[in-house]
Amino acid sequence: IWELKKDVYVVELDWYPDAPGEMVVLTCDTPEEDGITWTLDQSSEVLGSGKTLTIQVKEFGDAGQYTCHKGGEVLSHSLLLLHKKEDGIWSTDILKDQKEPKNKTFLRCEAKNYSGRFTCWWLTTISTDLTFSVKSSRGSSDPQGVTCGAATLSAERVRGDNKEYEYSVECQEDSACPAAEESLPIEVMVDAVHKLKYENYTSSFFIRDIIKPDPPKNLQLKPLKNSRQVEVSWEYPDTWSTPHSYFSLTFCVQVQGKSKREKKDRVFTDKTSATVICRKNASISVRAQDRYYSSSWSEWASVPCS
Amino acid sequence: RNLPVATPDPGMFPCLHHSQNLLRAVSNMLQKARQTLEFYPCTSEEIDHEDITKDKTSTVEACLPLELTKNESCLNSRETSFITNGSCLASRKTSFMMALCLSSIYEDLKMYQVEFKTMNAKLLMDPKRQIFLDQNMLAVIDELMQALNFNSETVPQKSSLEEPDFYKTKIKLCILLHAFRIRAVTIDRVMSYLNAS
């Protein structure tokens, strides 16, 4: 058993049918010695008396808010949560496996640049009685500071019969140098509590591996005289690290017909312009990627050919 | 990328081309190592990230773009001097650029070159003959060093009398390649920045 926060405790259980569970001793936080009784949640049934209460915690029915009283007055509370260990592996019931970029990916994180700021998000089908708490650091043995905000509900979607909820959090490394070469990964730890169930999820990454630039901005077309060709131009996104000559991007320019089946013409360039043939009803799209370290491509920025 | 790519101008800052080749070569070598050594811990998540140049060179600090010198977090151990040197800078206005930066890059390359050659000698003794260093990568390191044209003492190739532990050598190869790729990215960024200046 360990303390998650004041008066909230996590009991770790080897979870299998007929498991013996864990013996837990609760102590009433009071100078009083006599006439103390214990109850669980809203029930008025007295579970025991005395300054301490010994319970055998086996199932969720044994978890909850234990309260000690004296003469009708509440003295203190202890909330017991359960953390299930199923065949040596901690349960992952609360969050959905996003399966990207690989199986067992519960937390996904992205950074728009090298400033040390990043966003993580996760999915769940649970709509109520759900709380999250996020901590982060650079490295784990001698951790350096990363400050995270509060997790917030950022999107709701309908997936088949289920509703899916997306939560996200923004974090900022306290003293980040954009040009630094990372040798210790960022660690992100999310505590999730649903009703009386506790779970924790972790992700470990280098900022360089989660970079995804914003799409190029100011995408414009300039027709070339007496030609079906157009000059496409764009700019680096505002959120990208500067100077751009040091943090360079490379670009992919794509001409896509109206139908998805039509052949796509693609050109790669390090410049912020390109000359392409603009077909009728086609659209031109441009996306960006770090020129030197191949992390994710940005989303496409698009303009119609007409 | 096997699709059309815009080619750089021929009159470019001479080292940029070499540094781009370097990054391509080390990236290819790392990919090859990860595929060949699939049963070894060779992914970024599995290895310890060690920098053999730590406390010996200060490339990141010495080559920091001027715009980032205002960032407190980037100035931990910065001791830059604005002097010009090295043939890469020959035909440019480089009054603001640091000789320290280019000599630091040169020292990095020299250190990695020695490590890689020592390692290759060990790998050649492996009866499994599983993996060797790409000669192209070693050649590209050499070319960039020549382009940088800094003279410094020759570092003798390390020789080891004990029987090599091939498992450890292959894991060390992965660690070295990961670290060298990160340094090659920094070198490429620096060269690109110098080219634009």
């Epitope: 299998y16 049918p17 007929d18 065949d87 019931d93 089908t125 | 049963f39």
Partner: antibody
Framework: QVQLVQSGGGVVQPGRSLRLSCAAS????????MHWVRQAPGKGLEWVAF????????YYADSVKGRFTISRDNSKNTLYLQMKSLRAEDTAVYYC????????WGQGTMVTVSS | SYVLTQPPSVSGTPGQRVTISCSGG????????VKWYQQLPGTAPKLLIY???QRPSGVPDRFSGSKSGTSASLAITGVQAEDEADYYC????????????FGTGTKVTVLG
């Protein structure tokens, strides 16, 4: 006393369907994940499928994906395996088992796919 | 499609020490705990070892398990005639959990 009692096995022709049941007692069935495991005659153990305690997630071996469906009725304390488009290579003893460090197995039920 | 490899058979005379190996990889045994099962002819498997080296109550202490790196082993110290059975190791792969990964199985024969 944890008990898993299986039923539903038998002889079936290739291409036909069969449903296996596993009735649980002696524990809170709705709190635990459950597996199906099979063993072809003279062969080793092969995992078939898993279902979460609340039925929210199901996982299948590639060899049965799209043909077999694992399900549970927590109000009846019963686990099911619906097998469709059966093949000769599905012939095996099928076991249900609880998920956890200490597990309990059903007695097994024989499924024979033969024309 | 078995990823955990066991020797097909091992044998020993009563009282001898018999060991069965189970060889896997970094993503299974290297990352997860190992279990061992005993299966007597015509019966369901019975758990012998969980968590690499833990014995459930009721399992004789002549059975012991261990794990090192990407391999595990089961030892029967002082093998007895009633130990003649098939033995299976089991683990998980970190990418496909909760799918059970079973070993190929080992037939233990007690001679004489």
């Amino acid at each position: 006393q944890v008990q898993l009692v299986q039923s539903g096995g038998g002889v079936v022709q290739p291409g036909r369907s069969l449903r296996l049941s596993c009735a649980a007692s002696g524990f809170t069935f709705s709190s635990y994940g459950m597996h199906w495991v099979r063993q072809a005659p003279g062969k080793g153990l092969e995992w078939v499928a898993f279902i979460r305690y609340d039925g929210s997630n199901k996982y299948y071996a590639d060899s049965v994906k799209g043909r077999f469906t694992i399900s549970r009725d927590n109000s009846k304390n019963t686990l099911y395996l619906q097998m469709k488009s059966l093949r000769a290579e599905d012939t095996a003893v099928y076991y249900c088992k609880t998920h956890g460090s200490h597990d309990n197995w059903g007695q097994g039920t024989m499924v024979t796919v033969s024309s | 499609s078995y990823v955990l490899t066991q020797p097909p058979s091992v044998s020993g005379t009563p009282g001898q020490r018999v060991t069965i190996s189970c060889s896997g990889g970094r993503s299974n045994i290297g990352s997860n705990a190992v279990k061992w099962y005993q299966q007597l002819p015509g019966t369901a498997p019975k758990l012998l070892i969980y968590g690499n080296d833990q014995r459930p109550s009721g399992v004789p202490d002549r059975f012991s398990g261990s794990k090192s790196g990407t391999s595990a082993s089961l030892a029967i110290t002082g093998v007895q005639a009633e130990d003649e059975a098939d033995y299976y190791c089991q683990s998980y792969d970190r990418g496909t959990h909760p799918a059970l990964l079973f070993g190929t199985g080992t037939k233990v024969t007690v001679l004489g």
